[in-house]
Amino acid sequence: LSEEADDTDSELGSMKPLHTFCAMKADDGPCKAMIRSYFFNMYTHQCEEFIYGGCEGNENRFDTLEECKKTCIPGYEKTAVKAASGAERPDFCFLEEDPGLCRGYMKRYLYNNQTKQCERFVYGGCLGNRNNFETLDECKKICENPVHSPSPVNEVQMSDYVTDGNTVTDRSTVNNIVVPQSPKVPRRRDYRGRPWCLQPADSGLCKASERRFYYNSATGKCHRFNYTGCGGNNNNFTTRRRCLRSCKTGLIKNKSKGVVK
């Protein structure tokens, strides 16, 4: 679903970024996945889209436009509150539910102008309209009165994952698709790569049959599986080579003999 920027920068106050990493250039990393992400552009003072390769990169990378704005635009939270507090609620909050043309099954949230509340609905995966949010919290912040907003829903603790030292965000809503949460993978001392490389192959929610590859952390190899076209998880690559480049580098051989290249 394309996001259109209709915030006015004039309302956002000082343009010194909130965090030093917001000044970093967009870095797609060396891998070849194609993940729609967002970064803060120091020159335009806006959050913009870029395609992330799936590994490495830097901290100026966000899964959602909203997350980018909240993190890097000074005063954005106040502006969002102002927008949500009544007369200046965005027009798209009043759009009727639209599941879209396609028929995937994706959990989303919309603002219901009759009940004046954000509610869950099923999105088909393409087109639709902008009254369509990945999280209940995001919907409430933008379209409901923020005074009544609870703390963020479904916060995922990532402590069960072994990471490579970088901050790991919850990838269950990556690329604007909300996917079923796989059970958390137990701590794996012999793997220090991307956490999604530990996830099981997930064929997704639709009815297509597309050849994809997933990384099997038990064998240290990438295997073929059938992907149905939507949903699933990030352990999903269009070629074996991309799969290996993204995941193989995290495998520790005999715990001390270095990284398998």
Partner: antibody, heavy 123, light 112 residues
């Protein structure tokens, strides 16, 4: 096998209403795994999407901004067909008009097309 | 609106030789996990368009395996590994990332 059969006049006078119908066989206009669209083609503008309708929990429609004030696409469930009405036509609306099915389940594309109807707007 | 730009607009080909058509979008069409909101169609002379490739790289049913689609972000390619006489016509790319749905201006493939 899905088939789309178009019907309607090939000549329309300026300022009048262009009306075309697309009869569906092999699928249902009310199917929740399809959407139904009108697309036109002219030498000057190439392939131009005009609008689409689809039934999920209720009927939805979307129209191109360029024709939004003049277009209506309606389903006729009793005859298993859908229609295009384009009001206040001008010579710029002269084109070959196609109806098409959007496959919502697997392919996510226009996988079946009508035979096309050349509509000329002229007095 | 997302603008789809194809090149070349005309492509003379020799039967048995490969052919390649480029399509560029004015914004990214990648949605998730390599799924791309882009389709390719072929309109043979005197016929309606037919779906060739959906979601960027998947052949529609009945489409010969000499046709393949690839690309990511904003740059996409349709390749014909060995052109046959029946492949002549106009090829169109189409995006469905956002309304309005838009098509490229077409690439006319003809035998030399």
């Amino acid at each position: 096998q899905v088939q789309l059969q178009q019907s309607g006049p090939g000549l329309v006078k300026p300022s009048q209403t262009l009306s075309l119908t697309c009869a569906i066989s092999g699928d249902s206009v009310s199917s929740d795994s399809a959407a139904w669209s009108w697309i036109r083609q002219s030498p000057g503008r190439g392939l131009e999407w005009l609008g689409i309708i689809y039934k999920r929990s209720k009927w939805y429609n979307r129209y191109a901004v360029s024709v939004k004030s003049r277009i209506t696409i309606n389903p006729d469930t009793s005859k298993n067909q859908f229609s295009l009405q384009l009001n206040s036509v001008t010579p710029e609306d002269t084109a070959v008009y196609y109806c098409a099915r959007w496959h919502s389940d697997k392919m996510w594309g226009f996988d079946d097309w009508g035979q096309g109807t050349l509509v000329t707007v002229s007095s | 609106d997302i603008v789809m730009t194809q090149s070349p607009l005309s492509l003379p080909v020799t039967p048995g030789e490969p052919a390649s058509i480029s399509c560029r979008s004015s914004q990214s069409l990648v949605f998730s996990f390599g799924t791309t909101f882009l389709n390719w169609y072929l309109q043979k002379p005197g016929q309606s368009p037919q779906l060739l490739i959906y979601k960027g790289s998947n052949r529609a049913s009945g489409v010969p395996d000499r046709f393949s689609g690839s690309g990511s972000g904003t740059d996409f390619t349709l390749k014909i590994s060995r052109v046959e006489a029946e492949d002549v016509g106009v090829y169109y790319c189409q995006q469905y990332d956002s309304y309005p749905l838009t098509f490229g201006q077409g690439t006319k493939v003809e035998i030399k």
